[in-house]
Amino acid sequence: SAHLHPRDSCPLGPGRCCHLETVQATLEDLGWSDWVLSPRQLQLSMCVGECPHLYRSANTHALIKARLHGLQPDRVPAPCCVPSSYTPVVLMHRTDSGVSLQTYDDLVAQGCHCA
Amino acid sequence: SAHLHPRDSCPLGPGRCCHLETVQATLEDLGWSDWVLSPRQLQLSMCVGECPHLYRSANTHALIKARLHGLQPDRVPAPCCVPSSYTPVVLMHRTDSGVSLQTYDDLVAQGCHCA
């Protein structure tokens, strides 16, 4: 348990700490418009926000990183907000033989933590 | 393959991009000195450095995040440097009945990527 306990309440105020946020993006934004057919508009959940001391720590390494950042901020970066899990997305691809269904297991974030 | 290819050469110059770095820390630094007996000094490998566009992208999500950060930098953060794998560490713990060996699978980073 590392005797350091992650916390879930944001000390910076609502919406400031690491959380999931939906960003709309078109296939043009992604540079995918010539080979993905549909959907043309994607709801991309992403992890945004700060990772203050012990907030949503991913694991022991993150807890330690937070502690050492407090001691050596120039040497050790603060933990940062990254996906903890993903939601699969199915896109229709243009292929030489027509159209295929392609699953992306790691495109849209489902949960976030501080790593 | 997402038609965006992660790259491994750092465009910012040597040592500036996401990489593994060893940080020395004492049990006192970690706040563990009353319950971990040995070792008293730890070599903690951590992930530090920047994640410029497409550098060491962890997965499709990270590639997309890098792309959208370029388009909407205020809305979408750049990917950040986090562990991709860990190396187990064994510590000697003080327990009620004496001393025990405890393995930490997620304490010391072994590799880094941009997520």
Epitope: L37, P39, T87, P88, M92, V99, L101 | -
Partner: antibody, heavy 118, light 107 residues
């Protein structure tokens, strides 16, 4: 909100053709594709094919290949499904369904009953 | 094509009881599976996608599990409005295919 409104019931003779329409609203029509699914009376659901409203690319169920044509009219945000050489076993409720990035779809038309009878 | 087999064909359950519906794929569909509920005269309603993610507005008593070839839809405590036909659907490969359905009826 997303709505798919289909044309009314049709009665056709064997050998004839039917064209069912599906008018979309509540979203940008060209951003998503349309699936067509049918259901014979008292039976299960059968997937017929898919069309992307943006480019008109299609993918049809093999058993219907040559008899089915799916089209879209982007000016009216309407998708069409035409089935030719109708047989009695084509009697079914035909549904249009908007695709989503998650595979399953909550967006279904109300259904159009096509009866094939001599 | 991938054949989806649902069992049982009919399930008789009392209100308040748990219902467990099964869906088997003839080959792996990963987690690319959805569950729909259909009542007479209505279009199907999406309950679950991605094998286990509840669609917007779907009550917590509905849950999905499984991956690969074996999937389960569980209704933890049947309400009167839950008596209907349930279909599974795979969208891992063309052609998209549905199971034959399970009718959940009042015991």
């Amino acid at each position: 909100q997303v709505q798919l409104v289909q044309s009314g019931a049709e009665v056709k003779k064997p050998g004839a053709s039917v064209k069912v329409s599906c008018k979309a609203s509540g979203y940008t029509f060209t951003d998503y594709g349309i699936f067509w699914v049918r259901q014979a009376p008292g039976q299960g659901l059968e997937w017929m094919g898919w069309i992307t409203a943006y480019s008109g690319d299609t993918h049809y169920a093999q058993k219907l290949q040559g008899r089915v044509t799916m089209t879209t009219d982007t000016s009216t945000s309407t998708a069409y499904m035409e089935l030719r050489s109708l047989r009695s076993d084509d009697t079914a409720v035909y549904y249009c369904v908007r695709d989503t990035q998650y595979g399953g779809s909550p967006y279904w038309g109300q259904g159009t009953l096509v009866t094939v009878s001599s | 094509e991938i054949v989806m087999t649902q069992s049982p064909a009919t399930l008789s359950v009392s209100p308040g009881e748990r219902a467990t519906l099964s869906c088997r794929a003839s080959q792996s569909v990963s987690s690319n599976l959805a569950w729909y509920q259909q009542k007479p005269g209505q279009a199907p309603r999406l309950l679950i996608y991605g094998a286990s993610t509840r669609a917007t507005g779907i009550p917590a008593r509905f849950s999905g599990s499984g991956s690969g070839t074996e999937f389960t839809l569980t209704i933890s405590s049947l309400q009167s409005e839950d008596f209907a036909v349930y279909y599974c659907q795979q969208y891992n490969n063309w052609p998209i295919t549905f199971g034959g359905g399970t009718k959940v009826e009042i015991k």
